[in-house]
């Protein structure tokens, strides 16, 4: 089970209309140059067999993931939300930091690993659908965390 | 291309019950979230219920809950509602509807079909 | 429950004419709204999805805009075709709730 105190974002995290704003603009601005519309990240498939009491751990590995290799990688296009979506973004994933879960996290690691080999496959524009999937990446993390 | 038929609807008493379907053809059916909505004569659309792709969530309108039983077949690319202890208020066309996950929105409605609850 | 208030419930227009329409949340929503048509005796047809992309197929004459708690669905420029009943929804929470609908008929 996870350590759950340490799986925890407060809701207020969520509620701050500006960098809420700034991270769902982002999103559109990354979907619009998204042709590839056949494929979801962020899905149902995403939480198969994932209690939910992991999903927030779960969505700490997506986070650090897209943070990584995602949004560090692409942090000089569309600007000027990328410059201050990363910072929040690593805020929250700072807080996650001592989420962890006790046991097999063979399953968890397993879906996330079926996101990453998709994002990694199609490449570039595999980056530039994660960043367009930023809202549902808030979502999920917000309804897994709080 | 995508198409939804609902079927099932029909004249039933109060107190009754009846089973609507919802044949999905043109897409990945169990990739889909699903749901019915309603639409009483002359008034606006009332969503009642939904279904996760894999049939491990589901989620009611409080107006139903306890009445209204949603459920699929994927190998049937088959939606269902069973409907008891119907009321007249229950009287209306319901439709199906998918939405790929939790926080998509409705592309695609069948035609819809017709039930009403009368003595 | 989020409720959505629409407004107004009967708008009277002309062929070429700019129409708005007003959709309110009773809680923030983020951008999680989506505006259908629907013409007599048929199934709703989606429009907008998240409060301002425009949905396949549709005329660029609808835009949708806003977030939060406020939302409008624009018609550019009223077409014959575009007489109909318009309503909002949000899918940010389960239940899913729909506004009372729009009628946009001819004056």
């Known amino acids: 089970a996870p350590i759950s105190s340490h799986c925890r974002l407060d809701k207020s995290n969520f509620q701050q209309p500006y960098i809420t704003n700034r991270t769902f603009m982002l999103a559109k601005e990354a979907s619009l140059a998204d042709n590839n519309t056949d494929v979801r990240l962020i899905g149902e498939k995403l939480f198969h067999g994932v209690s939910m009491s992991e999903r927030c751990y779960l969505m700490k590995q997506v986070l650090n993931f897209t943070l990584e290799e995602v949004l560090f990688p692409q942090s000089d296009r569309f600007q000027p939300y990328m410059q201050e979506v990363v910072p929040f973004l690593a805020r929250l994933s700072n807080r996650l930091s001592t989420c962890h879960i006790e046991g097999d996290d063979l399953h968890i690691q397993r879906n996330v690993q079926k996101l990453k080999d998709t994002v990694k496959k199609l490449g570039e524009s595999g980056e530039i659908k994660a960043i367009g999937e930023l809202d549902l990446l808030f979502m999920s993390l917000r309804n897994a965390c709080i | 291309q995508v198409q939804l038929v609902e079927s099932g609807g029909g004249l039933v008493k109060p107190g009754g019950s009846l089973r609507l379907s919802c044949a999905a053809s043109g897409f990945t059916f169990s990739d889909y979230y699903m749901s019915w909505i309603r639409q009483a004569p002359g008034k606006g659309l009332e969503w009642v219920s939904a279904?996760?792709?894999?049939?491990?969530?589901?989620y009611y309108a409080d107006s139903v809950k306890g009445r209204i039983t949603i459920s699929r077949d994927n190998a049937k690319n088959s939606l269902y509602l069973q409907m008891n202890s119907l009321r007249a208020e229950d009287t209306a066309v319901y439709y199906c509807a998918r939405g790929l996950w939790v926080w998509d929105p409705l592309d695609y409605w069948g035609r819809g079909t017709l039930v009403t609850v009368s003595s | 429950d989020i409720q959505m208030t629409q407004s107004p419930s009967t708008l009277s227009a002309s062929v070429g004419d700019r129409v708005t329409i007003t959709c309110r949340a009773s809680?923030?929503?983020?951008?999680?709204l989506a505006w259908y048509q629907q013409k007599p005796g048929k199934a709703p047809k989606l429009l907008i999805y998240k409060a301002s992309s425009l949905a396949s197929g549709v005329p660029s004459r609808f835009s949708g805009s806003g977030s939060g708690t406020e939302f409008t669905l624009t018609i550019s420029s009223l077409q014959p075709d575009d007489f109909a009943t318009y309503y909002c929804q949000q899918y940010s929470n389960y239940p899913l709730t729909f506004g009372g609908g729009t009628k946009v008929e001819i004056k």
């Open positions: 279904i996760s792709g894999s049939g491990g969530s589901t």
């Open positions: 809680e923030g929503i983020y951008h999680w």
